[in-house]
């Protein structure tokens, strides 16, 4: 028993009119000694469960039950865990920024899409907020790989994404094919002018037959890109 409230330890309370340090009653606490009252302990119930139980000197600490996460200072509320395509921030669940994904349910942060070009591979399927990009097999590059910069969420951070190398390679291949066919057409036209006796049948029929035979080789590159039908010259 002391005669001054100033000397009281945490876990006690003391009234000025009767300066005696008294222990806090059950389910109450005081982290500072000499206060006229002890504080009521926090109860963790419902979506909350105890992280730390209350003692005479410290309040209880709560955390959220499985499937929920804390929000606010000292875990004042519980919010349902994030879905795939989201990540937790102070404000709660936020959709992944452009160029990032999260395929996990309830946990994890948004991470960048795989940079396929690091392994010399092309992008087969572009990514979403829930799924990473799908990289194709290694490609023989027809042109130097190009990069574009996407500025996520309007922030200054830039996310380096490889441009679809496969698309560029196919475009280059098709262009070359078109140039070759055009040249071939011109050469045939010149030969027809120079040596008309070679062409007994009309020219159109000959090229038509050639096109029919070659329809497959003409359509194959398009089919790879999901297109259909042959080229018409």
């Amino acid at each position: 028993v002391q005669n001054s409230c100033d000397n009281c330890q945490p876990g006690t309370f003391c009234r000025k009119y009767n300066p005696v340090c008294k222990s806090c009653p059950p389910s109450t606490f005081s982290s500072i000694g000499g206060q006229p009252n002890c504080n009521i302990c926090r109860v963790c119930a419902g979506y909350f469960r105890f992280k730390k139980f209350c003692s005479s000197t410290h309040n209880a600490e709560c955390e959220c039950i499985e499937g929920f996460h804390c929000l606010g200072p000292q875990c004042t509320r519980c919010e349902k865990d994030c879905r795939p395509g989201q990540e937790l921030t102070k404000q709660g669940c936020k959709t992944c920024s452009l160029g990032t994904f999260n395929d996990q349910n309830g946990t994890g942060v948004c991470r960048p899409w795989t940079n396929c070009s690091l392994d010399g591979r092309s992008v087969l399927k572009t990514g979403t907020t829930e799924k990473d990009v799908v990289c194709g097999p290694p490609v023989v590059s027809f042109s130097p790989s190009t990069t574009i910069s996407v500025t996520p969420e309007g922030g200054p951070g830039g996310h380096s994404l490889q441009v679809l190398t496969l698309f560029l390679a196919l475009t280059s291949a098709l262009l070359l094919a078109l140039i070759f066919i055009t040249l071939l057409f011109s050469v045939l036209k010149w030969i027809r002018k120079k040596f008309p006796h070679i062409f007994k049948q009309p020219f159109k029929k000959t090229t038509g037959a050639a096109q029919e035979e070659d329809a497959c080789s003409c359509r194959c590159p398009q089919e790879e890109e999901g297109g259909g039908g042959g080229y018409e010259l």
Partner: antibody, heavy 121, light 111 residues
Framework: EVQLVQSGAEVKKPGSSVKVSCKAS????????IYWVRQAPGQGLEWIGN????????FYGEKFMGRATFTADTSTSTAYMELSSLRSEDTAVYYC??????????????WGQGTLVTVSS | NVMLTQPHSVSESPGKTVTISCKLN????????VHWYQQRPGSSPTTMIY?????PDGVPDRFSGSIDSSSNSASLTISGLKTEDEADYYC??????????FGGGTKLTVL
Amino acid sequence: EVQLVQSGAEVKKPGSSVKVSCKASGYTFTSYYIYWVRQAPGQGLEWIGNIWPGNGGTFYGEKFMGRATFTADTSTSTAYMELSSLRSEDTAVYYCARRPDYSGDDYFDYWGQGTLVTVSS
Amino acid sequence: NVMLTQPHSVSESPGKTVTISCKLNSGNIGSYYVHWYQQRPGSSPTTMIYRDDKRPDGVPDRFSGSIDSSSNSASLTISGLKTEDEADYYCHSYDSTITPVFGGGTKLTVL
């Protein structure tokens, strides 16, 4: 025990490149972001960019885009930062730091010891 | 551009309390977590406060963090100042979850 150990100090000529390494241990290297931050003499902390070692995905600060390149070697749990076209203003201590995977706006819980890069002719 | 502004320096006597502010110039201070790092000369930064008001294990309870929405700023308060608290202190938050932002740093001098 989680540790990030960086390579030693470097002295470089203007226009050249420097490659700083950051070897991680004590945790799953592929499951946490590695951030790169620099501090010029007597100045504050400046974000350069970050890498997700799990797939090599990167983010770069606008100021460093095109000059900084991040890579990660998962076999040795080492992250690398290469900075090209060096100029005297790039003289700084370069830090790597790890961010926990709790939230997208989380703190950096572990830092490397720093690598001093001096750019001088 | 999002900026966090800190006082260049603060000083106080041992045993006293000091508060370092970190003001966000645009946006809402409540949008993203604020973290505080201590950096002693020649050393790497170490976390003193994370996620606005949480203390890592080993950091004394003399250190506390808070958010004030009315002034759009965060604060680091150190009570019972000790000479070993003399260091640079940096606040850290985000402009987006991809873009971290640091305050300019505050040099704390314990007189």
